[in-house]
Amino acid sequence: MAVTACQGLGFVVSLIGIAGIIAATCMDQWSTQDLYNNPVTAVFNYQGLWRSCVRESSGFTECRGYFTLLGLPAMLQAVRALMIVGIVLGAIGLLVSIFALKCIRIGSMEDSAKANMTLTSGIMFIVSGLCAIAGVSVFANMLVTNFWMSTANMYTGMGGMVQTVQTRYTFGAALFVGWVAGGLTLIGGVMMCIACRGLAPEETNYKAVSYHASGHSVAYKPGGFKASTGFGSNTKNKKIYDGGARTEDEVQSYPSKHDYV
């Protein structure tokens, strides 16, 4: 029962995590304009992995896609790649883990096969979570570097009368969503791996059986035959769980936060 709960919880946590990774990847607020030097701006800038946006105080929001591929910074491309790899691995992991769930009965699938699939999905979730965390962290590091560079530029060469306020960017909401989502996916993956250990066929020690030969009192005591500790078949301990398959219809969609006026 604990194994089923651990596996189920791992699946749900990973599902939420992957949904979060997808949301973070699609979000436009990876970096937002730092308002420390100009808190009364009538124009607010923010950027995502795929486009940059400008929100005017009038309510009008204009977003422009990064239509160039070669002209983009290598770091941004790397972050995109990490997030996409994370999503793909997570999606495959979810697909595998659905069939691995103990509460779902698929034909005569054995526990050992489910254990295999649970471990596979767990590893996929772990890698997916790590990809997301890495992607977000690389972007955050890029922001910090640019922030201090623009700060240095801001306070040099300001002898003239005309002030040029340089736009600096700080952490956007997507970074925090990405970190949390990556963490959840990672935790979900670990839970799946833990559940896998419980799903694996347990070691079976057959009790000694005495065979009494007629006329002879010789006892045959076969040594403790141990079942394979690998993920091979174990027909002796096969159990059928006919818990109904559950559909995951409650996955939240993430609406766009930008209204085009």
Partner: antibody, heavy 119, light 113 residues
Framework: EVQLVESGGGLVQPGGSLRLSCAAS????????MHWVRQAPGKGLEWVAY????????YYADTVKGRFTISRDNPKNSLYLQMNSLRAEDTAVYYC????????????WGQGTTVTVSS | DVVLTQSPDSLAVSLGERATISCKSS????????????LTWYQQKPGQTPTLLIY???TRKSGVPDRFSGSGSGTDFTLTISSLQAEDVAVYYC?????????FGGGTKVEIK
């Protein structure tokens, strides 16, 4: 057709108070930021205050800060300007305007209401 | 606060001639995010309310005659009336719409010579 109609202007003594209203129609009032702009007799335009669509952001000109309060009632499609501690230099025609257009531009203006501060 | 300095204060131009109004800002009004300048031009005819002419420093509002054009970037902006018409007699104002307070220039009165 977008319409902005100001009211509430009049003659008031220095130190007195007045509340200006602006009734909006012809557009989704609750979706747009609103401004008050004034023009003293024979002088140029002076921006007074701004309030965002949901009242989350409010800004004032330094000359009126602490004395004037901008507010809005979206269900009533109304904009207000509460003016306290009025001075002679506050004498002007007060316009309400909306940033209905791109670029934060003040696209639509009311006809204005006259405020005279005199003893 | 952003200070906008308009020049000249008044301008007398013959009908059909070019009128040029300058507006200088104490701070850059250029927004890197969308590569646009947040300066707006208004026209106020005698006894009337102001009307929007140009936004984003150079984009004409629909319905505005093409003899009106805006140019400039950063801190220096210009409004040009290529061929002055009688109905163009008015006071022209530039406005900073980049940061609060949304300051106006002092205005330039355009008259017919």
């Amino acid at each position: 057709e977008v319409q902005l109609v100001e009211s509430g202007g009049g003659l008031v003594q220095p130190g007195g108070s007045l509340r200006l209203s602006c009734a909006a129609s012809g557009f989704t009032f609750s979706s747009f930021g609103m401004h008050w702009v004034r023009q003293a007799p024979g002088k140029g335009l002076e921006w007074v205050a701004y309030i965002s669509s949901g009242s989350g952001s409010i800004y004032y000109a330094d000359t009126v800060k602490g004395r004037f309060t901008i507010s809005r009632d979206n269900p009533k499609n109304s904009l207000y300007l509460q003016m306290n501690s009025l001075r002679a230099e506050d004498t002007a025609v007060y316009y309400c305007a909306t940033s209905y257009y791109y670029g934060n531009a003040l696209e639509y203006w009311g006809q204005g209401t006259t405020v005279t501060v005199s003893s | 606060d952003v200070v906008l300095t308009q020049s000249p204060d008044s301008l007398a131009v013959s009908l059909g001639e070019r009128a040029t109004i300058s507006c200088k800002s104490s701070q850059s009004l250029f927004n890197v995010g969308n590569q646009k300048n947040y300066l707006t031009w208004y026209q106020q005819k005698p006894g009337q309310t102001p009307t929007l002419l140009i936004y984003w420093a150079s984009t004409r509002k629909s319905g505005v005659p093409d003899r009106f054009s805006g140019s400039g970037s950063g801190t220096d902006f210009t409004l040009t009336i290529s061929s002055l018409q009688a109905e163009d007699v008015a006071v022209y104002y530039c406005q900073n719409v980049y940061s609060y307070p949304l300051t106006f220039g002092g205005g330039t009165k355009v008259e017919i010579k």
